[in-house]
């Protein structure tokens, strides 16, 4: 699996989408887990509704929500009030019995908040409202991990 990078801004919300084949994964619940180290286990953060037919209902665990469009084949995870500690490697999973298939590997990057200054100058996002009240827009910029980029850089 390639790793897809999703970038969000500290204090704002980030939406992560994981597309999948709706026929292949028909009837399966989904989950969002956090990878603990490069070869460590993937620790479950939140999973879709116990009843697969109700997977469209948003389920929360703390500041993380999950919802599944089972017909369209898109799992959506929302990380609310993004913080530096949310940065890291995650997986979207499709569950069957005690097994889990990886739908997508996701690297979440938490960027500095351009709205932490009134004197933001060119920090404002182009085309976005400059009023503080309108600032908490959900940003979700994604890309594939570039060759040579390290999801788990060595700690200095």
């Amino acid at each position: 699996h390639n790793t897809t990078v999703f970038q969000g801004v500290a204090g704002q919300s980030l939406q992560v989408s994981c597309p999948y084949d709706s026929m292949k994964h028909w009837g399966r619940r989904k989950a969002w887990c956090r990878q603990l180290g490069e070869k460590g286990p993937c620790q479950r953060v939140v999973s879709t509704h116990n009843l697969w037919l109700l997977s469209f209902l948003r389920r929360w665990n703390g500041s993380t929500a999950i919802t599944d469009d089972t017909l369209g084949g898109t799992l959506t995870i929302t990380l609310r009030n993004l913080q530096p500690h949310d940065a890291g490697l995650y997986q979207c999973q499709s569950l069957h019995g005690s097994e889990a298939d990886t739908l997508r590997k996701v690297l979440v990057e938490v960027l500095a908040d351009p709205l932490d200054h009134r004197d933001a100058g060119d920090l404002w996002f182009p085309g976005e409202s400059e009023s503080f009240e309108d600032a908490h827009v959900e940003h979700s910029i994604s890309r594939s991990l570039l060759e040579g980029e390290i999801p788990f850089p060595p700690t200095s």
Epitope: Q83, P84, A87, A112, H117, R118, D119, A120, L123, I141
Partner: antibody, heavy 118, light 112 residues
Framework: DVQLQESGPGLVKPSQSLSLTCTVT?????????WNWIRQFPGNKLEWMGY???????IYNPSLKSRISITRDTSKNHFFLQLISVTTEDTATYYC???????????WGQGTLVTVSA | DVVMTQNPLSLPVSLGDQASISCRSS???????????LHWYLQKPGQSPKLLIY???NRFSGVPDRFSGSGSGTDFTLKISRVEAEDLGVYFC?????????FGSGTKLEIK
Amino acid sequence: DVQLQESGPGLVKPSQSLSLTCTVTGYSITSDYAWNWIRQFPGNKLEWMGYINYSGRTIYNPSLKSRISITRDTSKNHFFLQLISVTTEDTATYYCARWNGNYGFAYWGQGTLVTVSA
Amino acid sequence: DVVMTQNPLSLPVSLGDQASISCRSSQSLVHINGNTYLHWYLQKPGQSPKLLIYKVSNRFSGVPDRFSGSGSGTDFTLKISRVEAEDLGVYFCSQTTHALFTFGSGTKLEIK
């Protein structure tokens, strides 16, 4: 011109709390910017600890998240660092600094050395 | 964390020489607003770090034009065209693109 000055005890015992004050003059901490704590370990390594911004919102370094608290007293134009359960590994020179997104840390205090020792 | 790797750790120079310091980041430093928040600081003995260059290549006020910064993405360089005695000290790169701000380990510029 804005000036920052750190103050607090230079010696703290292991397992106790480290408390420092940054006094800001020449600029109101509620007007703008983010007000940071940065420490420098013996051997020069710099570590950003966290900040409190002009509106009072805090962001912390995840490595310190369970031990750190940054607060402020707007009437005195001070902001504070509290680090609980310190060990000898927390021995460092502690700086307060102002962050402006465009310029990085343009203004720093002179730093205060805190030694953690029994 | 975004790891900032500086090279060399020590740079012996003669006064008047050109000096070059490299800084590499483990992740891209391009913010989603298009800016790159890579900064350079100089710390002289017994002093706090002082801002030299902000956003890759912009000299902070009062910084002599012998200092210049360049680079993009993950690869950055600070150059001093003619080293003067007052330039000696430890140089740090730092990134404030990612919400967990990080610093390089420092490069000590010293007399040969």
